[in-house]
């Protein structure tokens, strides 16, 4: 059993039918010693008398608030949370897997440049009785300051018969420099608590590996004269990482036709103009990715040919 | 890919040049690592990141462009000299803090090379034959080094007599591998700043 | 104490479909995660499906995706296997199975697909 | 498919310690935990070993497991004829849990 904060309790438990389960003293917080009685939640149902109750914790009808009063009075309150360890896994109930990139990821996590600053969000389909407490910092046995926001409910979406709700954070690495190479990964620790279940879950990343700028902005096309050709152009988005000439960003240039089954014309660029031929009702997308360390592209700006 | 470049000035652009065929050798060598040693701990999350440059040379402090140094977060000021007779830049760019930069990544590139032939020399005597460095990484390395053209003491090949751990020594390339890559990367936007400037 | 009481096997021509069933007692069925496993005649165990405590996520092996649904009734404290499309080397008996640290599991049901 | 290899057969005399193997790698065995199973002809699989070491209440202590990286072992010191069976090792992939992944099973003989 530890303390998650003043007042409440985790007990971890070894989940699996028929399991001895935890064996818990709380104590109450008082300077009194005699007439001290025990109850759980709203039942008047007094469990013990005595500054001390022990109880043998198995299953969510043994979690909950415990107060200790006297004469009526209420002296403390301790509230037991339940940690599933499954099979030597801790269970993963109250969040889904988004299993991008890959298997287990509950938590996802990008940059829009190289500041520091990056935002976290999760899945879940649980709308009631949830709160979320997020905690982060820059390598895990000499930590360095990583500040968090609060989880806030940032979309919902209708899945099949199912609700899905989106929480996200926003962070900020304290003292980050933008043209750091970083040796210690940023780690992010998102305690959920929904009724009486506590779980924990962890992301372990590099900025530069969850990098993905916005879209280029201010993108134009200018008819070449006496030419089906046009030249399109764009510049850097307001949130990338300067100087751009030490940040640079690569382009993906595609024309695309109105039916997603014509064939797609594509070409790459450092510079952020090209030309292109531009077909009757396609469109003109452009998108970017940091030149250098290939990690996520933006996604697309587009315009229509017309 | 094969990208268009914009026109480099033409004192600086060798060291582009160079800089971007090193950053392509070194994640092709990376990525071939990662596909041959994958029953070996090589990835990006199970690695130690140790850079073997550090407290011997300080690159990104050193090759900050002038917008960071604003940023107190950047300002990790380690005294470090170095050689300044650089070749790269053209003469009336040639400035203390451009030289101490490409001094800076000259030792990186010395230091990495020392590093990797040692490897490669222990690697040729694996009876698994499983892993080599690329000649081609070994030789841009080379080439970046002559563009920069800076004098220094030759640091001598290690030798080391005790039979080599073959399992170590295809980690420790995954460690050195990554962190070149990182390095490499602000190699390149070290070259396209001054490029640009 | 803990018992797991299966029903539901027989023999089945390729094509066909069965319904196997597992009875839980003796313990809140409903807060537990569940598996079925099975073994080929001679072969080994080779794990086929696992329903989370409440229904709400379901996993298949590739061998069954699409062939087999896992499912339970916690009012009525049972575990399901519905095996559609049945083929020869789905012959095998079939285990339900709790999940946790300390198992338990069901007798077996042999399930025999031939024509 | 499996992914967690054992040696088919094992054997030994009464009394005698007989080893059995169980092969993985990092994404299995090196972040998972490891159980151990005992098949008696036409009886369902019994827990002997789980949390790698662990053993159940009612398993002899002459069964021992333990794990090292990314294999496992089950040691019977002084093996009797009653433990003539097949023995599975089990564990989880880091990417299919909660999918089960069995050994490929190994059968003991008690020889004389």
């Known amino acids: 059993i530890w303390e998650l904060k003043k007042d409440v309790y985790v007990v971890e438990l070894d989940w699996y039918p028929d399991a001895p389960g935890e064996m818990v003293v709380l104590t109450c917080d008082t300077p009194e010693e005699d007439g001290i009685t025990w109850t759980l939640d709203q039942s008047s149902e007094v469990l013990g008398s005595g500054k001390t109750l022990t109880i043998q914790v198995k299953e969510f009808g043994d979690a909950g608030q415990y107060t200790c009063h006297k004469g009526g009075e209420v002296l403390s309150h301790s509230l037991l949370l339940l940690h599933k360890k499954e099979d030597g896994i801790w269970s993963t109930d109250i969040l889904k897997d988004q299993k991008e990139p890959k298997n287990k990821t509950f938590l996802r996590c990008e940059a829009k440049n190289y500041s520091g600053r990056f935002t976290c969000w999760w899945l879940t389909t649980i709308s009631t009785d949830l709160t979320f407490s997020v905690k982060s910092s820059r390598g895990s046995s000499d930590p360095q300051g990583v500040t968090c926001g609060a989880a806030t409910l940032s979309a919902e979406r209708v899945r099949g018969d199912n609700k899905e709700y989106e929480y996200s954070v926003e962070c900020q690495e304290d003292s980050a420099c933008p043209a750091a190479e970083e040796s210690l990964p940023i780690e992010v620790m998102v305690d959920a608590v929904h009724k009486l279940k506590y779980e924990n879950y962890t992301s372990s990343f590099f900025i530069r590996d969850i990098i993905k700028p916005d879209p280029p902005k201010n993108l134009q096309l200018k008819p070449l004269k006496n030419s089906r050709q046009v030249e399109v152009s764009w510049e850097y988005p307001d949130t990338w990482s300067t100087p751009h000439s030490y940040f640079s960003l690569t382009f993906c240039v595609q024309v695309q036709g109105k039916s997603k089954r014509e064939k797609k014309d594509r070409v790459f660029t450092d510079k952020t103009s090209a030309t292109v031929i531009c077909r009757k009702n396609a469109s003109i997308s452009v998108r970017a990715q940091d030149r250098y360390y290939s990690s996520s592209w933006s996604e697309w700006a587009s315009v229509p040919c017309s | 890919r094969n990208l268009p470049v914009a026109t480099p000035d033409p004192g600086m652009f060798p060291c582009l040049h160079h800089s971007q065929n090193l950053l392509r050798a070194v994640s092709n060598m990376l990525q071939k690592a990662r596909q041959t040693l994958e029953f070996y701990p090589c990835t990006s999350e199970e690695i130690d990141h140790e850079d073997i440059t550090k407290d011997k040379t300080s690159t990104v402090e050193a090759c900050l462009p002038l917008e960071l140094t604003k940023n107190e977060s950047c300002l990790n000021s380690r005294e470090t000299s170095f050689i300044t007779n650089g070749s790269c830049l053209a003469s009336r760019k040639t400035s203390f803090m451009m030289a101490l930069c490409l001094s800076s990544i000259y030792e990186d590139l010395k230091m990495y090379q020392v590093e990797f032939k040692t490897m490669n020399a222990k690697l040729l005597m694996d009876p698994k034959r499983q892993i080599f460095l690329d000649q081609n990484m070994l030789a841009v390395i080379d080439e970046l080094m002559q563009a920069l053209n800076f004098n220094s003491e030759t640091v001598p090949q290690k030798s080391s007599l005790e039979e080599p751990d073959f399992y170590k020594t295809k980690i420790k390339l995954c460690i050195l591998l990554h962190a070149f890559r990182i390095r490499a990367v602000t190699i390149d936007r070290v070259m396209s700043y001054l490029n640009a400037s | 104490q803990v018992q797991l009481v299966q029903s539901g096997g027989g023999v089945v021509q390729p094509g066909r479909s069965l319904r196997l069933s597992c009875a839980a007692s003796?313990?809140?069925?409903?807060?537990?995660?569940m598996h079925w496993v099975r073994q080929a005649p001679g072969k080994g165990l080779e794990w086929v499906a696992f329903?989370?405590?409440?229904?709400?996520?379901?996993y298949y092996a590739d061998s069954v995706k699409g062939r087999f649904t896992i499912s339970r009734d916690n009012s009525k404290n049972t575990l399901y296997l519905q095996m559609k499309s049945l083929r020869a080397e789905d012959t095998a008996v079939y285990y339900c199975?709790?999940?946790?640290?300390?198992?338990?599991w069901g007798q077996g049901t042999m399930v025999t697909v031939s024509s | 498919s499996y992914v967690l290899t054992q040696p088919p057969s094992v054997s030994g005399t009464p009394g005698q310690r007989v080893t059995i193997s169980c092969s993985g790698g990092?994404?299995?065995?090196?972040?998972?935990?490891v159980k151990w199973y005992q098949q008696l002809p036409g009886t369902a699989p019994k827990l002997l070993i789980y949390?790698?070491?662990q053993r159940p209440s009612g398993v002899p202590d002459r069964f021992s497991g333990s794990k090292s990286g990314t294999s496992a072992s089950l040691a019977i010191t002084g093996v009797q004829a009653e433990d003539e069976a097949d023995y599975y090792c089990?564990?989880?992939?880091?990417?299919?849990?909660?999918?089960?992944?069995f050994g490929t099973g190994t059968k003991v003989t008690v020889l004389g």
């Open positions: 199975k709790t999940h946790g640290s300390h198992d338990n």
């Open positions: 003796g313990f809140t069925f409903s807060s537990y995660g």
């Open positions: 329903i989370r405590y409440d229904g709400s996520n379901k």
């Open positions: 990092r994404s299995n065995i090196g972040t998972n935990t």
């Open positions: 949390g790698n070491d």
């Open positions: 089990q564990s989880y992939d880091r990417g299919t849990h909660p999918a089960l992944l």
